[in-house]
Every structure is written in C-alpha cells, then in structure tokens.
C-alpha cells in the first residue's frame, strides 16, 4: 500500500534526526501529500525557514557554534517581512546576535551562509553601524526607531537567533 | 532513501586539479550536511571534508587544507569538491555521503554513501 510505505519512510526519516531534535512540528505543504516540511518543537516557522530564540548569553563565535550544533546558522535575514516576523518572538529589553559579521573591520560585512550581502535590504539602526571596532551585529530596539541592528564587539555575549532550513521529510 | 552519485575522478599528474561532483537524488539534500571521504589501497576510510546543511560550515582534514574546496549547490542538489596541488598520496577512491543535520568528521555519522570516484595521481 502506497499511504503505509510513504508513512514508514518518514517515520524512518524522524529518527534519524531524534538526537538533534526530539520532537518535530510537520505540516503538509500544498495539496501534495508527499511534501511535509518540519521544524523542531518548539522552533518557529516562516516560509521555508525554523527560527530559534536563542536566550543564553554568548560571545558571537560561540553563538554561531550553538546554532551550528542544532543544524543551523545563526539568522541571515533577506527581506522586512521575515524580519517583522523575527521581531514578534523578541524581547524589546534584549538584544540578539545575527549572522552578519565584519571580520576585517573594513565594513564588508558578510552573512555567515555566504548569501551576498545587499545595502538595499538593511535594518541598521540611523548612525549605524559606527565603530570599526564592533565587527558583529546584533538587532535591538529602540523606541525612536524601534527594531534595528548595531554593530557591537563580537566578544560581548548577547541573546541570538538561530536559522535553519525547514526539514523535509 | 538518498541516493549519491559521485563523477568526476580520473587520472592526474602531481601539481594538477580535478573537480568532484556528487548528485543526490532527491531535494531532502538540504536536510543533510555533507562530507567527502577517501580510501587509499589497504588502508581505511579517511576524512576529508565536510560541509553545514547552509554552507556555512566547513571542515577540512590537515593533509588537504588549503589544497582543497569543498562547495554545495542547494538549488541543484550537488556537491562538490575542488582539488587543486593534487599529490601521489591523494590517490585513493573518493566517496561523498550525507548525515542529518549537523555536520561530522567520523564516518559513522553518515547515513549515506556513493559507490565512489576513483583519483589516481601520478608523479
């Protein structure tokens, strides 16, 4: 029976990624019943993209090394809608590392996936970023602006925000 | 079940490139970080690197840094691997394989293997 094999492929496909991710949140995509897309529980989920609020306090390297550890990044964010999305899981009196970084401390800044980076689809906060020194970014809020991203010293642990690709199973 | 076909070995004289490919069969590719690992005659599966889900992450062994380049295209479902300043002791039949998530080193952690591409270098 075609439904039984397809389910017992999947349930195979879950337990190889159980000791990462426990629990797993699917949905089917469209009206094609082949096509589950998943998320870890109790990650969230936009387009096709798992977002995870990260609330230890760590340095950027090492917040990096924590997302990559669950199969992520920390979060490349490409558009203003997945950014006001990002910002309904925030906490305004925080602040989140993301996956931009300017190791040279020339201002080329770099997403951690390599996706180009585009001036044209930036949040900085106005008058950011400032300082040659602060080589990592982060978002914050503030209340003249509200959410907007600064660059900070990469070494001062923050919050972060970890990205994955959806898990398709 | 992910399927891999490694292309591209061949024969290449010391101080020359080639460029590994590995197809993989279905779009769960980007469920998976990837890796390439290598068997020289008697001896055992040896690391050689590996790559994040994203390609964000990559990992190399010490014998091929700087010497190699390991690439994924997600939108094609392929992976790749730049060896250039190819030496004698880089002979070996080359496998790519996959495991889930997060990216490894061990062998044991990978689901999934080619049948492998050979590499012989000549001096």
């Known amino acids: 029976n075609f439904m039984y094999s397809k389910t017992v492929k999947r349930l195979s496909k879950l337990r190889e990624y159980q000791q990462y991710h426990p629990s797993l949140t699917c949905v089917m995509e469209g009206k094609d019943i082949e096509d589950w897309s998943c998320c870890p529980t109790p990650w969230t989920s936009f387009q096709s993209s798992c977002y995870f609020i990260s609330t230890g306090m760590q340095s950027w390297t090492k917040s990096q090394k924590n997302c990559s550890v669950m199969g992520a990044d920390l979060v490349v964010i490409n558009t203003r809608e997945e950014q006001d999305f990002i910002i309904q899981n925030l906490k305004r009196n925080s602040s989140y590392f993301l996956g931009l970084s300017d190791p040279g401390g020339r201002r080329h800044w770099q997403w951690v996936d390599q996706t180009p980076y585009n001036e044209n689809v930036t949040f900085w906060h106005s008058g950011e970023p400032n300082n040659l020194d602060e080589r990592c970014a982060i978002i914050n809020f503030r209340s003249s602006e509200e959410w907007g991203w600064n660059d900070i010293h990469c070494h001062v642990p923050q919050k972060s925000i970890c990205k994955m690709k959806k898990i398709y199973i | 079940q992910v399927q891999l076909q490694e292309s591209g070995g061949g024969l290449v004289q010391a101080g020359g490139s080639l460029r590994l490919s590995c197809a993989a069969s279905?779009?769960?590719?980007?469920?998976?970080?990837m890796g390439w690992f290598r068997q020289g005659p008697g001896k055992d599966r040896a690391f050689v690197a590996a790559?994040?889900?994203?390609?964000?992450?990559?990992s190399y062994a010490d014998s091929v840094k700087g010497r190699f380049t390991i690439s994924r295209d997600n939108a094609e479902n392929i992976l790749y691997l730049q060896m250039n300043s190819l030496k004698p002791e880089d002979t070996a039949v080359y496998y790519c394989?996959?495991?889930?998530?997060?990216?490894?080193?061990?062998?044991?952690?990978?689901?999934?293997w080619g049948q492998g591409t050979q590499v012989t270098v000549s001096s």
């Open positions: 394989a996959a495991a889930p998530l997060v990216l490894k080193t061990t062998p044991g952690a990978y689901n999934y």
């Open positions: 279905e779009r769960t590719f980007t469920n998976y970080a």
């Open positions: 790559i994040s889900r994203s390609g964000s992450s990559t």
